[in-house]
C-alpha cells in the first residue's frame, strides 16, 4: 500500500531573467527512492538516480542546475517557462509518487502591481 505523501515548494511566481528552486519531499513512507525525474509538460528536464547521480537533459543544460538535494534550480527564466512541473519519485516497493508545482514567470512590468517576486 502506498502511504507516502509528496510535499512541494508550492506554486511559484517569479520574474523573467531570475532563478527559482523547485523542491519536493517524500514523507510518511519507508520506501527506498531509486530515482527522481523532473518533467515539464511531457518534457524530461532532469533525472537524479540513486546509483548514477544526476543527468540533465541536453536542451536544458544551460539553464538547469541540480539540487539543492533532490530539487532543481531553474535559471535565466523566460515567459515560456510558465507551466506545470512534476517531480516523479520512483520508489521500492511502493511505486511512483508525483508532486506538482506551477511556475508563473512574469515580465518585469508586472512589478507595478505590487507582486512580490521570488528570486533567491
Amino acid at each position: 500500500m502506498m502511504t507516502g505523501t509528496i510535499e512541494t515548494t508550492g506554486n511559484i511566481s517569479a520574474e523573467k531573467g531570475g532563478s527559482i528552486i523547485l523542491q519536493c519531499h517524500l514523507s510518511s513512507t519507508t520506501a527506498q527512492v531509486t530515482q527522481v525525474n523532473w518533467e515539464q509538460q511531457d518534457q524530461l528536464l532532469a533525472i537524479c538516480n540513486a546509483d548514477l547521480g544526476w543527468h540533465i537533459s541536453p536542451s536544458f543544460k544551460d539553464r538547469v542546475a541540480p539540487g539543492p538535494g533532490l530539487g532543481l534550480t531553474l535559471q535565466s527564466l523566460t515567459v515560456n517557462d510558465t507551466g506545470e512541473y512534476f517531480c516523479i519519485y520512483h520508489t521500492y516497493p511502493d511505486g511512483t509518487y508525483t508532486g506538482r508545482i506551477f511556475l508563473e514567470v512574469l515580465e518585469s512590468s508586472v512589478a507595478e502591481h505590487g507582486a512580490r517576486f521570488q528570486i533567491p
Epitope: I12, S13, T82, G83, E84, F102, E104, L106, A115
Partner: antibody
Framework: EVQLQQSGPELVKPGASMKISCKAS????????MNWVKQSHEKNLEWIGL????????SYNQKFKGKATLTVDKSSSTAYMELLSLTSEDSAVYYC????????????WGQGTSVTVSS | DVVVTQTPLSLPVSFGDQVSISCRSS???????????LSWYLHKPGQSPQLLIY???NRFSGVPDRFSGSGSGTDFTLKISTIKPEDLGMYYC?????????FGGGTKLEIK
C-alpha cells in the same frame, strides 16, 4: 476594460461532447493564464484547470482529466473548454476566469455558461 | 489535494453588522518563498464571482475598505466591517498555492 464573453447556454444529450468558448478583450490575451471553474447545483465551486495562452501549456485538476480539454486560439483571443462524454453530473454553470498575474487568483470572470445534460 | 474548510456555512446578518468568515486549509498555504496565495470572492445571485481580496490581505481594485483579509499558514479570515445590502451573497476563499487550486465550501451571507 477587461471582458470575458462566454458562449450561450447548452442543452446536450448524455454521452455527447460540447465546447464552450470564452472570448477575451481589453488586455493582452497571452499575458495571463486562463482558468476554468465549475459551479454545480449544490453551489460549490471547483477549479477545473488552467491554460497558458502564451504556449498552450495546461494544468488540470485530476478530477477533470479526461472530462475537460482546454485549448486556445491566439488569433481570436479565445479560450475553449471541451467537455467529453457528458452525464447528468456535468450539468452545471461553467466559468472562464483570468488569472491575476503573480497571485494565483482570478481577477476577471466570464458571465458563465449553463450546461444541462438531459435526454 | 488541499482541503479548504469555510465556516460558518450560513451567516444571518443585519445591515450595519460587522462579521467574520473563517477559512482553514489542511496544510500551510505559504510556499517555500514565504508567499501565500489565498484569495476571497463574492458571488451575488445572477452575477459572476468577483475578486475581493488576494494574497491574504490585498484589496482588489474598486473593493471598499470595509472588506479586509488577514491570517497566515492554515488559518485565514475575511472581515466585513459594516454590512450593506450589496454585500449579500456567497463568499468563497480559494487557495492557489498548491495544485490543484481548491475553493472553500462557501458562506452564505443573508439577511436575518
Amino acid at each position: 476594460e477587461v471582458q470575458l464573453q462566454q458562449s450561450g447556454p447548452e442543452l446536450v444529450k448524455p454521452g455527447a461532447s460540447m465546447k464552450i468558448s470564452c472570448k477575451a478583450s481589453g488586455y493582452s490575451f497571452t499575458g495571463n493564464i486562463m482558468n476554468w471553474v465549475k459551479q454545480s447545483h449544490e453551489k460549490n465551486l471547483e477549479w477545473i484547470g488552467l491554460i497558458n495562452p502564451y504556449n498552450g501549456g495546461t494544468s488540470y485538476n485530476q478530477k477533470f482529466k479526461g472530462k475537460a480539454t482546454l485549448t486556445v486560439d491566439k488569433s481570436s483571443s479565445t479560450a475553449y473548454m471541451e467537455l467529453l462524454s457528458l452525464t447528468s453530473e456535468d450539468s452545471a454553470v461553467y466559468y472562464c476566469a483570468r488569472g491575476f498575474r503573480g497571485y494565483f487568483a482570478m481577477d476577471y470572470w466570464g458571465q458563465g455558461t449553463s450546461v444541462t445534460v438531459s435526454s | 489535494d488541499v482541503v479548504v474548510t469555510q465556516t460558518p456555512l450560513s451567516l444571518p446578518v443585519s445591515f450595519g453588522d460587522q462579521v467574520s468568515i473563517s477559512c482553514r486549509s489542511s496544510q500551510s498555504l505559504a510556499n517555500s518563498y514565504g508567499n501565500t496565495y489565498l484569495s476571497w470572492y463574492l458571488h451575488k445571485p445572477g452575477q459572476s464571482p468577483q475578486l475581493l481580496i488576494y494574497g491574504i490581505s490585498n484589496r482588489f481594485s474598486g473593493v471598499p475598505d470595509r472588506f479586509s483579509g488577514s491570517g497566515s499558514g492554515t488559518d485565514f479570515t475575511l472581515k466585513i466591517s459594516t454590512i450593506k445590502p450589496e454585500d449579500l451573497g456567497m463568499y468563497y476563499c480559494l487557495q492557489g498555492t498548491h495544485q490543484p487550486w481548491t475553493f472553500g465550501g462557501g458562506t452564505k451571507l443573508e439577511i436575518k
